[in-house]
């Protein structure tokens, strides 16, 4: 999906009003410094597509997050505020139905999660570039 | 282990600009933000901004927008924190703090005295 | 800003006692609350983070509660050392604020 015509600025208050108190929420207990930082994004389409590749797809360690309150909330805001995007995930829900797992905090979990908020915090700099 | 090494007292002139350095070392200098938070004499701790060294983007407190500026020499892996048009109000402990994507401070510099006065 | 309101500003105790000190976020802040220690003339020390997680090395008679607007520092038996100033600090929000202080003296 190409996120260039989202309405950032309505994403961006969806993290700020709900998003991020989730992936607070999520994170606790978890020291600050205990993950490196070592995804980035250069625009906000781009952090967006990382975002929802973290959110979204299972990975090596960490399947469950897309069951979080952060990931549906995200998963919401941007099939409001992304034109279109709401069509393409149909295929990837019912994938992802079929192989529902229970849900468990792993640290490869709380680590993506953290990778997250850094991605997001880049999202929401007010000089980053759109495209 | 971490440490973040702090430059020495300073005594300005109102209108003056004062910058303060925190060397790092003992992790990746890339890894964490970099922070300045100040303490006036018997005041509260006042966070004033931050920076992430990967690419040097900085935020900054509003109450200090326009006067404070937060830059990283890479190849020395120090940080900087310059504050402008000194008043005595300024006068302060300036304090650099490291933090992950969590914002709370595990790690801190000894601290700077700035004394502003004319 | 979120403002964090601390209370008693100054406490009177004597080693071996019990104390506890209060903090107030403006509005809800989760569980994202880290409390500090400082001595003079020296930097803060994290001692709770996550509003009940001690920091590494902090002895167990610090203890801290709390979630949502309301949050507790507990000394469960003074020491000597614990003679300084405490603050409590919000990271749900950007920008991050901290309490405005109880210094701790010695009765």
């Known amino acids: 999906y190409d996120f260039t015509n989202c309405d950032f600025e309505k994403i961006k208050a969806a993290y700020l009003s709900t998003i991020s108190k989730d992936l607070i929420t999520y994170m606790s207990g978890t020291k600050s410094t205990e993950f490196n930082n070592t995804v980035s994004c250069s625009n906000r389409p781009h952090c967006l597509t990382e975002i929802q590749s973290l959110t979204f797809n299972p990975t090596a360690g960490c399947a469950s997050l897309a069951k979080e309150m952060f990931a549906m909330k995200t998963k919401a805001a941007l099939a409001i505020w992304c034109p279109g995007y709401s069509e393409t995930q149909i295929n990837a829900t019912q994938a992802m139905k079929k192989r529902r797992k229970r849900k468990v905090t792993t640290n490869k979990c709380l680590e993506q999660v953290s990778q997250l908020q850094g991605l997001w915090r880049r999202f929401n700099r007010p000089l980053l570039k759109q495209q | 282990q971490v440490q973040l090494v702090q430059s020495g007292a300073e005594v300005k002139k109102p209108g003056a600009s004062v910058k303060v350095s925190c060397k790092a070392s003992g992790y990746t200098f890339t890894s964490y933000l970099m922070h300045w938070v100040r303490q006036a004499p018997g005041q509260r701790l006042e966070w004033m901004g931050e920076?992430?060294?990967?690419?040097?983007?900085?935020d900054y407190n509003q109450n200090f927008r326009g006067r404070v500026t937060i830059t990283v020499d890479m190849s020395a892996s120090t940080a900087y924190m310059e504050l402008s048009s000194l008043r005595s109000e300024d006068t302060a402990v300036y304090y650099c703090?490291?933090?992950?994507?969590?914002?709370?401070?595990?790690?801190w510099g000894q601290g700077t005295l700035v004394t502003v006065s004319s | 800003d979120i403002q964090m309101t601390q209370s008693p500003s100054f406490l009177s105790a004597s080693v071996g006692d019990r104390v506890t000190i209060t903090c107030k976020a403006s509005?809800?802040?989760?569980?994202?609350v880290a409390w500090y220690q400082q001595k003079p003339g020296k930097a803060p020390k994290l001692l709770i983070y996550?509003?009940?997680m001690r920091h590494t090395g902090v002895p167990s008679r610090f203890s801290g509660s709390g979630s949502g607007t309301e949050f507790t520092l507990t000394i469960s038996s003074l020491q000597p050392e614990d003679f300084a100033t405490y603050f409590c600090q919000q990271y749900s929000s950007f920008t991050f604020t901290f309490g405005q202080g109880t210094k701790l003296e010695i009765k």
């Open positions: 509005q809800d802040v989760v569980t994202a």
């Open positions: 703090a490291l933090t992950g994507t969590i914002n709370y401070f595990d790690y």
């Open positions: 996550w509003a009940s």
């Open positions: 920076i992430d060294p990967s690419d040097s983007y900085t």
